[in-house]
């Protein structure tokens, strides 16, 4: 903490701009105003201050707002951000999307920090449902916070919310978390015709029942390997042969070379070898 | 580690001009900012004119706005202040300064570098 002395003659800051930047940091702590400072808080980022700098400034804002800052000057925080604790975050109310965006722009190239996790989950409470928008904002950021989140966390995600997650957003994704997400999509996109349908749902089909599994081989979609090998193995292993080789159509090769990995070696296991000889491809029940 | 030398200081007329430079022994084209800071004898250190390499416009303190204009050659490394119209209140020891970086965002301080200084005198 830097020690209280007085402003010397001449440097009492009248506004925050380039005069302070080799301001020591004592001068800045008895010579910048704390209000001057939260009305002038868009200024800061423009100054390149050192982070022992910010600290001095963000000491001042502490002091000013020790219940937490207003949203106004949150959203004009830009590098001070990075000084902020998950304790300091905590005490505030960010309602606004701009001021998430403004906030997770500063982070942006970093790994998801506590500070950032902690923001998120006061924006996302504070609103009460991860809705589209704000869906939207923190997957351009962060493409895994979709499978960061708890499935307890997911279940507030609204169906609409949906059409915003992209395949890579569910790269992640535990079967526990598309088993949540996959009946929201499955509600969202139950409007498209087929073919259309298929290309939307195919990144949550982790989470699929095997009732959804055969009325998909009834629909001509060319499943994959990849997104087969996704499945859940409950919900393969009773499907027939006769359905996979639906559903997979011409990649129903591909099971030879995933013949001893899950779930096409417990479904291999649980088929008759005659159904399977009829695949023409060597595999052993 | 940037080394920075003034020079162009000396004694000069009032309504006269002076020209300063700084020479830096690295690179500044990736510094953070570069700035001319002067101290007038008995007074405080002063920022008088600084280019922000984050902004489109340069700094120039009220009292010198019109009269001076800073400037950098990355080619030679080198820092201007071309100082027109001196007033007998301009006379001070000119200081180069440079931010390279804004240092570790848990702890560590920034790098700013400083010349040793040259001295303008404004008399008549």
């Known amino acids: 903490e830097v020690e209280k002395t007085a402003c010397p003659s001449g440097k009492k800051a009248r506004e925050i701009d380039e005069s302070l930047i080799f301001y020591k940091k004592w001068e800045l702590e008895a010579c910048v105003d704390a209000a001057l400072l939260a009305t002038q808080m868009d200024r800061v980022n423009a100054i390149p201050f050192t982070y022992e700098q910010l600290d001095v400034l963000k000491h001042k804002l502490d002091e000013l707002y020790p219940q937490g800052y207003p949203e106004s000057v949150i959203q004009h925080l830009g590098y001070l951000f990075l000084k902020m604790s998950p304790e300091d975050i905590r005490k505030w109310n960010v309602t606004s999307l701009e001021t998430l965006k403004a906030l997770l722009e500063v982070n942006k190239g970093h790994e998801m920090s506590p500070q950032v996790a902690t923001l998120i989950d006061r924006f996302v409470k504070g609103r009460g449902q991860l809705d589209k928008d704000t869906l939207d904002t923190l997957t351009a950021f962060y493409p895994g916070y979709l499978c960061s989140l708890s499935p307890e966390e997911l279940s507030s995600v609204p169906p609409s919310s949906i059409w915003a997650v992209r395949p890579q957003d569910l790269d992640t994704c535990d079967p526990r978390q598309l088993d949540v997400l996959y009946p929201k999509a499955r509600l969202a996109f139950q409007n498209m015709n087929g073919s259309e349908y298929f290309v939307k749902i195919q990144s949550f089909l982790g989470g699929a029942p095997t009732e959804d599994l055969k009325a998909l081989s009834q629909q001509n979609v060319s499943m994959d390997l990849a997104t087969f090998m996704k499945l859940r193995t409950d919900a393969v292993l009773p499907l027939t042969v006769a359905e996979v080789q639906k559903l997979l159509g011409p990649h129903v090769e591909g099971l030879k070379a995933e013949e001893r990995h899950r779930p096409v070696r417990d479904w291999i296991l649980r088929q008759r070898q005659d159904d399977l000889d009829t695949l023409g491809l060597g595999l052993q029940g | 580690q940037v080394q920075l030398v003034e020079s162009g200081g000396g004694v000069v007329q009032p309504g006269r001009s002076l020209r300063l430079s700084c020479a830096a022994s690295?690179?500044?084209?990736?510094?953070?900012?570069m700035g001319w800071v002067r101290q007038a004898p008995g007074k405080e250190r002063e920022l008088v004119a600084g280019i922000n390499t984050g902004a489109t416009t340069n700094y120039y303190a009220d009292s010198v706005k019109g009269r001076f204009t800073i400037s950098r050659d990355n080619s030679k490394n080198t820092l201007y202040l071309q100082m027109n119209s001196l007033r007998a209140e301009d006379t001070a020891v000119y200081y180069c300064?440079?931010?390279?970086?804004?240092?570790?965002?848990?702890?560590?301080?920034?790098?700013?570098?400083w010349g040793q200084g040259t001295l303008v005198t404004v008399s008549s």
């Open positions: 690295g690179t500044i084209s990736e510094a953070l900012y």
């Open positions: 300064a440079v931010r390279k970086d804004r240092g570790v965002e848990n702890g560590g301080p920034g790098h700013d570098y």
